[in-house]
């Protein structure tokens, strides 16, 4: 399709080198298109558009996305070609940031309804750079966090080292939807709640003589609790003793409770202490069976082929461990009888 | 591999020291670090075990309490020190290492040995 | 203190033959107990591991088995190659002491 009628936007992302990051393209359609397509309807309830002439479907992946090839090459489709982009909705999510992500990225929708829909594009000339800013030493992560039923607040990473006074007009989205009332740099929260976590964009103009852009920062939020003041607790095995028959396979799970930690590094592990002799076992990783904002439950397995005469005399010694302190349960085999 | 050093001819009454040097890995809790003996044409003696860990602890023949000595010094090297020698002492010294591997496997190896003779 | 007593201190088999060695503790080793073979001029080689596990690359003619203060090493189709001594040892360090201690050897001439 014939992209020169399709709206312009320039965007700028600087990236951080330190930090992970991820960074999001709206299809930005004209105005009162948008409502049939994504639902980011920047309207007021009373205000009605004149006139829709995009009749697209309401379905919110309507939208396709492309992305343009310098060398002048045809429009090569997202989805098919770029892994670590990913689209949802009318949202064009980048999972990793790097100057490879500069180009030109077009959106229109999917279905065609009228003759009006062909011009129904918008063009997104994204540049991407790494921060050079050292100046800024402490800017604001893009991972945030708000400590529930407490005060606190997100700032914009890319306009956190300037002052509330002379910082530009922000334009903030909270995943995918405008904050109409947010203007600065800073939302403060009076008291954090659980939907406050989410992903923020936000948006400011930079201009020079020649022309303007959007630079864009993507902040994750989550709401979190404060740190837990206890070691972690196992949960399973709750006997130090496990009858066995010889010869046969046997797993053994331990399971434990952690608490909620904002620097969350769990340890658990299995080892074997045989006499005096103790060594660590390879076993299956840890999973998470149980996740919640207050802790976690963490299960890891030992598996034995098959139980020997020696097994009964070892003791195989459940250990975990957070920045509070370890816990450890240690279970021995006895040999069933009859 | 396991290596001992040390060994030669002393008078009786005369102090020494051997040295293991592992190479090829490094100590860890899952097993001991042994000395062993045999005299020419006798059966082999068990001296003394060191637990490799960060334990050391330290396990002896009734008959080598306090006169011999084995020492943890590095990641990769035991000694055992033996002191007021006699000709009784004259022996092939071997370094074993005995215990199980990091997978809970058993692992025996043994250096070629060192002789030691006391005689006047 | 363990002490190893080991019998018979000396035995002949003929090949394809079989050899049992016995080896008893002085008291309870909980199968710490390990069996070596011994050429001239040459360190052990570990044979049997924790009473009756074969170590690796062993032939599986070496059989161990006993518990407890008794404890057996069977040869079984004896071949020239297995004319060597033989020692047990426990291997029972941390106990209250000697837990390392070998027995006195049983050497094997193979006609």
């Known amino acids: 399709f014939n992209i020169s009628g399709c709206s312009t936007k320039k965007l700028l992302w600087t990236y951080s080198t330190r930090s992970e990051e991820e960074f999001v393209l709206f299809c930005d359609l004209p105005e009162p298109q948008k409502s049939h397509f994504c639902h980011r309807n920047r309207l007021s309830p009373k205000q009605v558009p004149e006139h829709l002439p995009f009749m697209g479907s309401n379905d919110l992946s309507d939208v396709q996305w492309y992305q343009q090839p310098s060398n002048g090459d045809p429009l090569e489709d997202i989805r098919k070609s770029y892994p670590h982009i990913i689209q949802d909705k009318c949202t064009l999510h980048f999972l990793t940031p790097g100057v490879n992500n500069s180009g030109s990225y077009i959106c229109r929708p999917k279905m065609i309804k009228s003759p009006y829909d062909v011009a129904c594009c918008v063009k997104m000339i994204l540049e991407v750079k790494p921060q050079t800013n050292a100046s800024c030493e402490y800017s604001a992560s893009h991972k945030q966090d708000l400590l529930l039923g407490s005060t606190g607040s997100i700032s914009c990473p890319s306009l956190s080292c300037q002052s509330d006074a002379q910082s530009p007009a922000v334009t903030w989205y909270k995943n995918g939807k405008l904050l109409s009332v947010e203007r600065s740099n800073r939302i403060v929260v009076d008291e954090v709640y659980d939907y406050h976590q989410g992903t923020y964009v936000c948006d400011y103009t930079q201009s020079d003589t020649v022309s303007s852009w959007t630079v864009r920062a993507v902040v994750q939020v989550r709401t979190i609790v404060g740190d837990t003041k206890l070691k972690p607790d196992i949960l399973d095995p709750v006997e130090d003793t496990l009858e066995v028959e010889l010869g046969k396979p046997l797993t053994i799970s331990c399971k434990a409770r952690f608490g909620f930690e904002r620097v969350f590094n769990p340890v658990i592990k299995w080892y074997i202490k045989d006499s005096d002799l103790e060594w660590e076992v390879s076993v299956p990783e840890a999973k998470s069976i149980k996740s919640t904002l207050k802790d976690e439950i963490i299960e890891r397995n030992i598996i034995l082929e098959k139980v020997t005469q020696r097994d009964l005399r070892r003791k195989f010694v459940c250990f975990v461990q957070n920045s509070i302190g370890n816990t450890t349960q240690s279970v021995q085999l006895k040999e069933k009888r009859g | 591999s396991l290596e001992e050093s040390g060994g030669g001819l002393v008078k009786p009454g005369a102090s020494l020291t051997l040295t293991c040097t592992a190479s090829?890995?490094?100590?860890?809790?899952?097993?001991?670090m042994c000395w062993v003996r045999q005299a020419p044409g006798k059966g082999l003696e068990w001296i003394a075990c060191?637990?490799?860990?960060?334990?050391?602890?330290a396990y002896y023949a009734s008959w080598a309490k306090g006169r011999f000595t084995i020492s943890k010094t590095s990641s990769t090297t035991v000694t055992l020190q033996m002191t007021s020698l006699t000709a009784a002492d004259t022996a092939t010294y071997f370094c074993?290492?005995?215990?199980?591997?990091?997978?809970?496997?058993?692992?025996?190896?043994w250096g070629p040995g060192t002789l030691v003779t006391v005689s006047s | 203190a363990i002490k190893m007593t080991q019998t018979p201190s000396s035995v002949s088999a003929a090949v394809g033959g079989t050899v049992t060695i016995n080896c008893r503790a002085s008291?309870?080793?909980?199968?710490?107990l390990a069996w070596y073979q011994q050429k001239p001029g040459q360190p052990p080689k570990l044979l049997i591991y924790d009473a009756s596990d074969l170590a690796s690359g062993v032939p599986s003619r070496f059989k161990g088995s006993g518990s407890g203060t008794e404890y057996t090493l069977t040869i079984s189709g004896v071949q020239c190659d297995d004319a060597a001594t033989y020692y047990c040892?426990?291997?029972?360090?941390?106990?209250?002491?000697?837990?390392?201690?070998f027995g006195g050897g049983t050497e094997v001439v193979v006609k």
């Open positions: 040892q426990s291997a029972y360090y941390s106990s209250s002491t000697d837990g390392g201690a």
């Open positions: 074993a290492r005995d215990g199980y591997d990091d997978y809970g496997d058993p692992f025996n190896l």
């Open positions: 060191i637990h490799a860990g960060s334990s050391g602890s």
């Open positions: 090829g890995f490094s100590f860890s809790s899952s097993y001991y």
């Open positions: 008291e309870d080793i909980k199968s710490y």
